[in-house]
Amino acid sequence: FKVATPYSLYVCPEGQNVTLTCRLLGPVDKGHDVTFYKTWYRSSRGEVQTCSERRPIRNLTFQDLHLHHGGHQAANTSHDLAQRHGLESASDHHGNFSITMRNLTLLDSGLYCCLVVEIRHHHSEHRVHGAMELQVQTGKDAPSNCVVYPSSSQESENITA
């Protein structure tokens, strides 16, 4: 399986909400002995490998933000901890999973990584990740809504989170 990032860059005004998205692409084994662990963390663009370093998102670690389920089941973080920090991660039945960040500040700018781990006994631990950048802007040059830049081309889209 692979992870796709529909958008590689999100440019948002301060105070806005944004939803960062990743998509799990098949083939996805839906056997009873296979489960998927999905989570989010901040990182930096390493010289060797992007997303190798794991930093918290608003003081929440990737352990606090994970989703766990088999195949393409829906799931979301329900505990109050994430919501108290203005965060919520979720996934749907189609392999999409996301993290929503509310009331953005300049400190939220940086590189964000989604991680998927396939858990299967007696097999290698299969890990894949996706990376995207969030730029939070303030002042007269800031957009009125979030602008997202697709990973495949340089065309941009305006979105209202």
Epitope: D33, T35, Y37, V48, S52, F62, Q63, D64, H66, H68, H79, L81, L115, V117, I119, H121, H122, H123, S124, E125, R127
Partner: antibody, heavy 118, light 107 residues
Framework: QVQLVESGGGLVKPGGSLRLSCAAS????????MSWIRQAPGKGLEWVSW????????YYADSVKGRFTISRDNAKNSLYLQMNSLRAEDTAVYYC???????????WGRGTLVTVSS | EIVLTQSPATLSLSPGERATLSCRAS??????LAWYQQKPGQAPRLLIY???NRATGIPARFSGSGSGTDFTLTISSLEPEDFAVYYC?????????FGQGTKVEIK
């Protein structure tokens, strides 16, 4: 930040049983995947068993499969290891540790000593 | 299962010296290798994850390198509190396995 404290160790005769507990303080234990790891006196570390946050799936080392059972009670913030048919070679300090997929054992308890001897 | 072999078994050095510890895997573990430090009577502490990344709060004098089957933990300048036993551990395959440990002792 979660803190882990093991209990339930002690002296038991070969063939006997023991139940270890790992109590977690702090939040959110119910989100964490956990393992038991043991260390025989003066020896190295050996992974014993793993359990997901929801209780399934569960994995065991071949050396304990069929004799040990891992379980958890998220409402009580507790992890357990039921050890049956104990052998002398099971003598060790048993640690519980957080073991998230794609990650490492990043949070450990202080351990509880199990001695199997006649 | 994957066997991890650490060398040397014991390393006798003085404070301020450089320590180089080796871990070799019986088959490739990609970069899914960690290093732990353990002091007498204490639980192990995570130092390095994914072969080369320092865990939170670990001093910069600790560094890890390698991929595949050969890995190295380097302590650039030993501090008194660094004398301990160091274990490597792989999570590429079940079961999780550890090396037998390298003891870093004061010369």
């Amino acid at each position: 930040q979660v803190q882990l404290v093991e209990s339930g160790g002690g002296l038991v005769k070969p063939g006997g049983s023991l139940r270890l507990s790992c109590a977690a303080s702090g939040e959110p234990f119910s989100d964490y995947y956990m393992s038991w790891i043991r260390q025989a006196p003066g020896k190295g570390l050996e992974w014993v068993s793993w359990i997901s946050n929801s209780g399934e799936p569960i994995y065991y080392a071949d050396s304990v499969k069929g004799r040990f059972t891992i379980s958890r009670d998220n409402a009580k913030n507790s992890l357990y290891l039921q050890m049956n048919s104990l052998r002398a070679e099971d003598t060790a300090v048993y640690y519980c540790a957080r073991d998230e997929p794609g990650w490492e054992f990043d949070l450990w308890g202080r351990g509880t000593l199990v001695t199997v001897s006649s | 299962e994957i066997v991890l072999t650490q060398s040397p078994a014991t390393l006798s050095l003085s404070p301020g010296e450089r320590a180089t510890l080796s871990c070799r895997a019986s088959q490739s573990v990609s970069s899914y290798l960690a290093w732990y430090q353990q002091k007498p009577g204490q639980a192990p502490r995570l130092l390095i994850y994914d072969a080369s990344n320092r865990a939170t709060g670990i001093p910069a004098r600790f560094s890890g390198s390698g991929s595949g089957t050969d890995f190295t933990l380097t302590i650039s300048s030993l501090e008194p509190e660094d004398f301990a036993v160091y274990y490597c551990q792989q999570r590429n395959n079940w079961p999780r396995t550890f090396g037998q440990g390298t003891k870093v002792e004061i010369k």
